[in-house]
Interface confidence: low
């Protein structure tokens, strides 16, 4: 009778084992071991026992001891079980960002590992087991579906293999995959709200605000604001689940025309975009042109108003005829026109909005000098010793210089309070002089002597 020891062995892959083959008869004709494994016989005294070292055991094997005794041939098998931990434990790659409410399929692949009967695959979120299954197939694959929730944000998912050899007197061998960190997000289906001027004048600044509610996690949202292809640099303010991006936009003559204002919000692997049209316009104030800003009385003056080619102008409240960018009026300058304002108002329609600009010019009319009866009476009669103020006002632009002299030497004190005396009496020649010319007027002062009763 042939026997083998040990009858069962569990050993690590590539390991060695000593197997003893024995027979019950004293003088066996034959005693040996049949195995594909590399073997080395250890020499022992006696004929009925042999010890072999079997090495480099890579897989499960059943070496067989045999002996040939007078009463016949017999055999005995030993069962070698090889154990090894998996060579690959991997979660199938997934986008790191996942929208809340989506079903996320976690797939773990396990290559190698034995004995399979003792190998289990566990899918975990943090330390919480989501699924536990025996490893089946090569590679073994275990899947589970997770409904993505907001509170999963930042959670680590992993896959672990457990090779449990504790029943065989060994230990529990664990292998864990690289973790997959889930980033959850919510990007609402509504596009961002974009508030901006619909029209913007060249060489001015406007403010653009882009906002969106219902985002998670709001701090991870990227905001791109652009006018045409000019990237804007917004200041972003965050709320609990909202943001507001405010940017100042400056436009130049090069930007004139219809521009696209874009606000794009990118969160996770999704984006929402709002486009709006902004019309950038150039509209200088209208030009008021006077033939000459300073003219002499009686001169023909042309007042012209010129504005943007598409504008409509009114000059001193009178619309251009025909309605358009130019208007003019003709006048003969009178003293009353001195200091007169000529105001041009231009209106331009830009993208359905009416824009108004004004310009005013003043006319100076040179006239005079003038001395007339109303302002410089030709005759005064005053009682002697009374207090009087001689008044004579010369008119003109520029204001004339006025002198009233008697006999070419004695001045009449114009505008001063005087005590009337006999020597004030007489005829004075009042002379008003300016760059526009000279006029004279005779003024007579009569002094009434008091009657002595």
């Amino acid at each position: 009778q042939t026997s083998v020891s040990p009858s069962k062995v569990i050993l690590p892959r590539g390991g060695s084992v000593l197997v003893t083959c024995s027979t019950s008869c004293d003088q066996p004709k034959l005693l040996g071991i049949e195995t594909p494994l590399p073997k080395k016989e250890l020499l022992l005294p006696g004929n009925n026992r042999k010890v072999y070292e079997l090495s480099n055991v890579q897989e499960d094997s059943q070496p067989m001891c045999y002996s040939n005794c007078p009463d016949g041939q017999s055999t005995a098998k030993t069962f070698l079980t090889v154990y090894w931990t998996p060579e690959r434990v991997e979660l199938a790659p997934l986008p790191s960002w996942q929208p809340v409410g989506k079903n996320l399929t976690l797939r773990c692949q396990v290559e190698g590992g034995a004995p399979r009967a003792n190998l289990t695959v566990v899918l975990l979120r943090g330390e919480k087991e989501l699924k536990r299954e025996p490893a089946v197939g090569e590679p073994a694959e275990v899947t589970t579906t997770v409904l993505v929730r907001r509170d999963h944000h930042g959670a680590n998912f992993s896959c672990r293999t457990e090779l449990d050899l504790r029943p065989q007197g060994l230990e529990l061998f664990e292998n864990t995959s690289a973790p997959y960190q889930l980033q959850t997000f919510v990007l609402p289906a509504t596009p961002p709200q974009l508030v901006s001027p619909r029209v913007l004048e060249v060489d001015t600044q406007g403010t653009v605000v882009c906002s969106l509610d219902g985002l998670f996690p709001v701090s991870e949202a990227q905001v791109h604001l652009a006018l045409g292809d000019q990237r804007l640099n917004p200041t972003v303010t965050y709320g609990n689940d909202s943001f507001s991006a405010k940017a100042s936009v400056s436009v130049t003559a090069e930007d004139e025309g219809t521009q696209r204002l874009t606000c794009a919000v990118i969160l996770g692997n999704q984006s929402q975009e709002t486009l709006q049209t902004v019309t950038i316009y150039s509209f200088p104030a209208p030009n008021v042109i006077l033939t000459k800003p300073e003219v002499s009385e009686g001169t023909e003056v042309t007042v012209k108003c010129e504005a943007h080619p598409r504008a409509k102008v009114t000059l001193n409240g009178v619309p251009a005829q025909p309605l358009g960018p130019r208007a003019q009026l003709l006048l003969k300058a009178t003293p009353e026109d001195n200091g007169r304002s000529f105001s041009c108002s231009a209106t331009l329609e830009v993208a359905g909005q009416l824009i108004h600009k004004n310009q005013t010019r003043e006319l100076r009319v040179l006239y005079g000098p003038r001395l007339d009866e109303r302002d410089c009476p030709g005759n005064w009669t005053w009682p002697e010793n009374s207090q009087q103020t001689p008044m004579c006002q010369a008119w003109g632009n520029p204001l004339p210089e006025l002198k009233c002299l008697k006999d070419g030497t004695f001045p009449l004190p114009i505008g001063e309070s005087v005590t009337v005396t006999r020597d004030l009496e007489g005829t004075y020649l009042c002379r008003a002089r300016s760059t526009q010319g000279e006029v004279t007027r005779k003024v007579t002062v009569n002094v009434l002597s008091p009657r002595y009763e």
Epitope: A226, G228, D229, Q230, D255, G257, R260, L275, I280
Partner: antibody
Framework: QSLEESGGRLVTPGTPLTLTCTVS????????MSWVRQAPGKGLEYIGW?????SAYYANWAKGRFTISKTSTTVDLKITSPTTEDTATYFC???????????????WGPGTLVTVSS | AFELTQTPSSVEAAVGGTVTIKCQAS??????LSWYQQKPGQPPKLLIY???TLASGVSSRFKGSGSGTEFTLTISDLESADAATYYC?????????????FGGGTEVVVK
């Protein structure tokens, strides 16, 4: 300021092909860039564009058939799975400085010919 | 789907004459329309944008007009160098609506 397309050649149906537009004299960080094609003897067909920030936008008919990307000095158009109907001259063009509109194309490359045939 | 229809597809005129090309949009695009000229073997060249504004360096013999859905390109005092195909293009809306779309083209033959 100039644009030059390259990469056009004879390919068999289904073989992905990438065309490159090399720009000089201006910065891609300030302009939107478009791709337009023209089949032999036919009219112009707008494919799509990529913005200064790198976001790509495609005409409805072109979605899934083309991919636009860029580096600091080049803009690429990948024809993902060419068919004989994609035989055409492909132009890249710059927009953006007339009223800022991406679609007003004031600078064009000479074009590169792609022939798809088995 | 949005469409730009150009008429006629081909037109012939003598040197010194005038040619009118029409472009009709299937929906209103305000004044967001450009015109391009393309000669054989060359890329297109921008002529007009915003329906009526001449691009830099373009002769004043080219005149664009219209808004909404009806647009016209008029070439007056024709020269032999004007022989080319002319395309209109919308730049209203986004790319998935009408942005970027071209008309079918009009060939101008100068006798």
């Amino acid at each position: 300021q100039s644009l030059e397309e390259s990469g056009g050649r004879l390919v068999t149906p289904g073989t992905p092909l990438t065309l490159t537009c090399t720009v000089s004299g201006f910065s891609l960080s300030s302009y939107g860039m478009s791709w337009v094609r023209q089949a032999p003897g036919k009219g112009l067909e707008y494919i799509g564009w990529i913005s200064f920030s790198g976001s790509a936008y495609y005409a409805n008919w072109a979605k899934g058939r083309f991919t636009i990307s860029k580096t600091s000095t080049t803009v690429d158009l990948k024809i993902t799975s060419p068919t004989t109907e994609d035989t055409a001259t492909y132009f890249c063009a710059r927009g953006g400085d007339y009223g800022g509109s991406t679609y007003i194309l004031n600078l064009w490359g000479p074009g590169t010919l792609v022939t798809v045939s088995s | 789907a949005f469409e730009l229809t150009q008429t006629p597809s081909s037109v012939e005129a003598a040197v010194g004459g005038t040619v009118t090309i029409k472009c009709q949009a299937s929906e209103s695009i305000d004044s967001y329309l450009s015109w391009y000229q393309q000669k054989p073997g060359q890329p297109p060249k921008l002529l007009i944008y915003a329906a009526s504004t001449l691009a830099s360096g373009v002769s004043s013999r080219f005149k664009g007009s219209g808004s909404g859905t009806e647009f016209t390109l008029t070439i007056s005092d024709l020269e032999s160098a004007d022989a080319a195909t002319y395309y209109c293009q919308s730049y209203s809306g986004t790319i998935t609506t009408s942005g970027g779309a071209f008309g079918g083209g009009t060939e101008v033959v100068v006798k």
